[in-house]
């Protein structure tokens, strides 16, 4: 099977490595612009040179291309609890992360939020905390996951699922409770 | 085929508390991440509320935190959205959505939404 190209592919498949078809003129390929600028003029001719102007401050473009226009400096998402970890220059857009002792979560494919990872309080780190995924933690006896928090068993109630870790405690709480009964 | 439904909205006084909810269909609903969104009269949409599939991950705008809480019941299928001291700014539709797994997109599917009208 050919995979389905688009009209820009096309055109430019047709150019070798670096070049693409001019808009005007399917036997003219142009040099492209490098990364950092963008395309002012088309080249007048073959062998002549493509007008490419570099990239106006909050704008970048980050590989070599034919585009009209630079695209917009992403901003880092406050409101996420995002931190700029580098600013945009011409040729690199922002990068984003999160603060020390945090991880991501994405909420979709370009969106995250910074979480505070896990200190595993009453219970051992089994997996460190890392950029993508919280620490995973194991809890102390007399205690359960709950929402990657390790929990006092007394706060187990039987419809959950911590009674099966929790099992001899609520036996000990219930017992506690018979033999006040005496 | 995916389909969600909004109920609970009405006409409600300021400080007043309100709960929608949204009953979902057509997806395995506890493999995705749901949220609310609102859109004022003549204003443009504004996220309010995300929660992750097991409700370990909530977001919530800044305009909405300490008064809201999303929550989700995996068991039955349903989305909903806890809204106390409600104010006359959050006057808007409130709609439903299912966020994109993947592409550019934060949502792939939105409900037909509820009206929430905060006034005395």
């Known amino acids: 099977l050919v995979p389905h190209l688009g009209d820009r592919e096309k055109r430019d498949s047709v150019c070798p490595q670096g070049k693409y078809i001019h808009p005007q003129n399917n036997s003219i390929c142009c040099t492209k612009c490098h990364k950092g600028t963008y395309l002012y003029n088309d080249c007048p001719g073959p062998g002549q040179d493509t007008d490419c102007r570099e990239c106006e401050s909050g704008s970048f473009t980050a590989s070599e291309n034919h585009l009209r226009h630079c695209l917009s400096c992403s901003k880092c998402r406050k409101e996420m609890g995002q931190v700029e970890i580098s600013s945009c220059t011409v040729d690199r857009d922002t990068v984003c992360g999160c603060r020390k002792n945090q991880y991501r979560h994405y909420w979709s494919e370009n969106l995250f939020q910074c979480f505070n990872c896990s200190l595993c309080l009453n219970g051992t780190v089994h997996l460190s905390c890392q950029e993508k995924q919280n620490t995973v933690c194991t809890c102390h006896a007399g205690f359960f996951l709950r929402e990657n928090e390790c929990v006092s068993c007394s706060n187990c109630k039987k419809s959950l699922e911590c009674t099966k870790l929790c099992l001899p405690q609520i036996e000990n709480v219930k017992g506690t409770e018979d033999s006040g009964t005496t | 085929e995916v389909q969600l439904l909004e109920s609970g909205g009405g006409l409600v006084q300021p400080g007043g508390s309100l709960r929608l909810s949204c009953a979902a269909s057509g997806f395995t609903f506890d493999k995705y991440q749901m949220g609310w969104v609102r859109q004022a009269p003549g204003k443009g949409l504004e996220w309010v509320s995300f929660i992750d599939s097991n409700g370990h991950h909530t977001y919530y705008a800044d305009s909405v935190k300490g008064r809201f809480t999303i929550s989700r019941d995996n068991s039955k299928n349903t989305l909903y959205l806890q809204m106390n001291s409600l104010r006359a700014e959050d006057t808007a539709v409130y709609y439903c959505?299912?966020?994109?797994?993947?592409?550019?997109?934060?949502?792939?599917?939105w409900g037909q939404g509820t009206l929430v009208t905060v006034s005395s």
């Open positions: 959505a299912q966020l994109s797994v993947q592409g550019s997109n934060l949502f792939d599917y």
